[in-house]
C-alpha cells in the first residue's frame, strides 16, 4: 500500500503519500481554531505508471493507453485513498468545543 | 456536475470530462476483444482551483492551501467520479462470450 509507513521511509518517485504540514492561520486563514495550531495533512504526488497501485479497471486501461501513447495528456493521477479525521478545539463564547473534522489527513494514495 | 452533458457542450478549462476514444488493438494491444473495436473511454483533465467540484473535506483544505501558497506542488487532481461498464464480445474457442467490463467509461469527474 502507498501509505505513510512505506512512502515516508522510501525515496519512491512514483505516486506516494508525501509529508505536508498545514498551519491553520498562515496556510488557510483559519484563525478560530485554538488547538492544534496546524497538522500533518500530507498529500499525494508522483507519476502513475502502468500497474502502479491502480484504482479501477478504467485506471488500468488508461495507464496502458499511456504506455502505448506516451505523449497523451490522458493519464491516471495520484490522489488520496485513505483519509483520517482530525480532532480540533475551538471556542464558542467561553466554552471550548471539541470537534472531529472528517477526512482531513491523507494516510495513503492511489492512482485514479 | 462535471459530467459529459456539461463538459462536452462547454469550453470549460477547469477539471472536466474530456473525449477520448480508445482502440483496443492500437492503444492497448488487446487483440482478444471481438466487439467493439474500441470505445469512448473519456478522461478527466483540467486544474482544480478553489471550490471547483471538490470531493472531500481534505480536497477543500488542499485547494485553500493552494490559494495561500500558489507555488506549492500539493494540489487536488482531476479524476473520475462516475464510471460505467462496457459490454464486450470475445471468443472462447469458437464460442462467442458476452461480458460486462466494469468501470470502463468515465461519465463525470471530481477534484480529489
Amino acid at each position: 500500500a502507498l501509505d505513510t509507513n512505506y512512502c515516508f521511509s522510501s525515496t519512491e518517485k512514483n505516486c506516494c503519500v508525501r509529508q505536508l504540514y498545514i498551519d491553520f492561520r498562515k496556510d488557510l486563514g483559519w484563525k478560530w481554531i485554538h488547538e492544534p495550531k496546524g497538522y500533518h495533512a500530507n498529500f499525494c504526488l508522483g507519476p502513475c505508471p502502468y500497474i502502479w497501485s491502480l484504482d479501477t479497471q478504467y485506471s488500468k486501461v488508461l495507464a496502458l493507453y499511456n504506455q502505448h501513447n506516451p505523449g497523451a495528456s490522458a493519464a491516471p493521477c495520484c490522489v488520496p485513498q485513505a483519509l483520517e479525521p482530525l480532532p480540533i478545539v475551538y471556542y464558542v463564547g467561553r466554552k471550548p468545543k471539541v470537534e472531529q473534522l472528517s477526512n482531513m489527513i491523507v494516510r495513503s494514495c492511489k492512482c485514479s | 456536475a462535471l459530467d459529459t452533458n456539461y463538459c462536452f457542450s462547454s469550453t470549460e478549462k477547469n477539471c472536466c470530462v474530456r473525449q477520448l476514444y480508445i482502440d483496443f488493438r492500437k492503444d492497448l494491444g488487446w487483440k482478444w476483444i471481438h466487439e467493439p473495436k474500441g470505445y469512448h473511454a473519456n478522461f478527466c483533465l483540467g486544474p482544480c482551483p478553489y471550490i471547483w467540484s471538490l470531493d472531500t473535506q481534505y480536497s477543500k483544505v488542499l485547494a485553500l492551501y493552494n490559494q495561500h501558497n500558489p507555488g506549492a506542488s500539493a494540489a487536488p487532481c482531476c479524476v473520475p467520479q462516475a464510471l460505467e461498464p462496457l459490454p464486450i464480445v470475445y471468443y472462447v474457442g469458437r464460442k462467442p462470450k458476452v461480458e460486462q467490463l466494469s468501470n470502463m467509461i468515465v461519465r463525470s469527474c471530481k477534484c480529489s
Epitope: L28, G29, W30, K31, W32, Y90, Y91, V92, G93, R94, K95, E99, L101 | Y50, I51, Q57, K60, V61, L64, Q67
Partner: antibody, heavy 119, light 112 residues
Amino acid sequence: QVQLQQPGAELVKPGASVKMSCKASGYIFTSYWITWVKQRPGQGLEWIGDIFPGTGSTNYNEKFKTKASLTVDTSSSTANMQLSSLTSEDSAVYSCARKLGPNYAVDYWGQGTSVTVSS
Amino acid sequence: DVVMTQTPLSLPVSLGDQASISCRSSQSLIHSHGNTYLHWYLQKPGQSPKLLIYKLSNRFSGVPDRFSGSGSGTDFTLKISRVEAEDLGVYFCSQSTHVPFTFGSGTKLEIK
C-alpha cells in the same frame, strides 16, 4: 469587494417552511464563518447561529435550535438557512453576515431577507 | 443570557459636538484568553449594520479616528469626537464572550 447577497422578501403561510440564501462574493468563502441574525422592529437583534463553510461546523442559539437549520454549498459560495413551522413570531428581517471565528465581530452584513408569515 | 443595556435610547447632538454612548453588560465580557469581545456597529436607515469597533477598542478598517471604544468588564463607551452628518443612525453594541451572543437595543444618534 465583499458582498453578501440575499433575496429581498419571502411571503410564507403559517406552519410552512422557508429556505433563504446568502450568496457570498469578493472573498474566500471557506475562510470565514457565516452568522445569521434576526431583526424585528422594536425587538432589536437576535443571534440565530453560525456555520463555517470550510468544515460545515455549526453553532446555534438554543432558542433557535429547533427552528433554524444552517447549511452551505461551497461550490456556489452560498449559505442557506431554513426556518420551519413558521408562526407570526417568525416575521422579521433575517440577515447573514461574515466573521473570522465564532467569537469574532461581524465585519460585513447582507441586506437581509424580509420574511412575512401570513395566511 | 447576557443582557446588553444601552443608554441613552436617543441622543440628539449638534454637528461638530462630541457624542458618548454607553453599553452595560449583565456579566463581565472578559474572556479567559484576556480578550474583551465587545463590538460596536452603526446602522443607517434602510442599510445593513457596519462594523465600527471590534474587541473593545480596535477600529475596523476605513473607520475614521473620531470613533473610539473604551471600557472594561461590564461598562463600555463609544465616543465620537466630532459628529458629522454621515454618523447619524442607530448604534448597537454586541458581545461574543458568552453564548448566546447578544446585542444592545440600540441608540439613535440624531440632529438636535
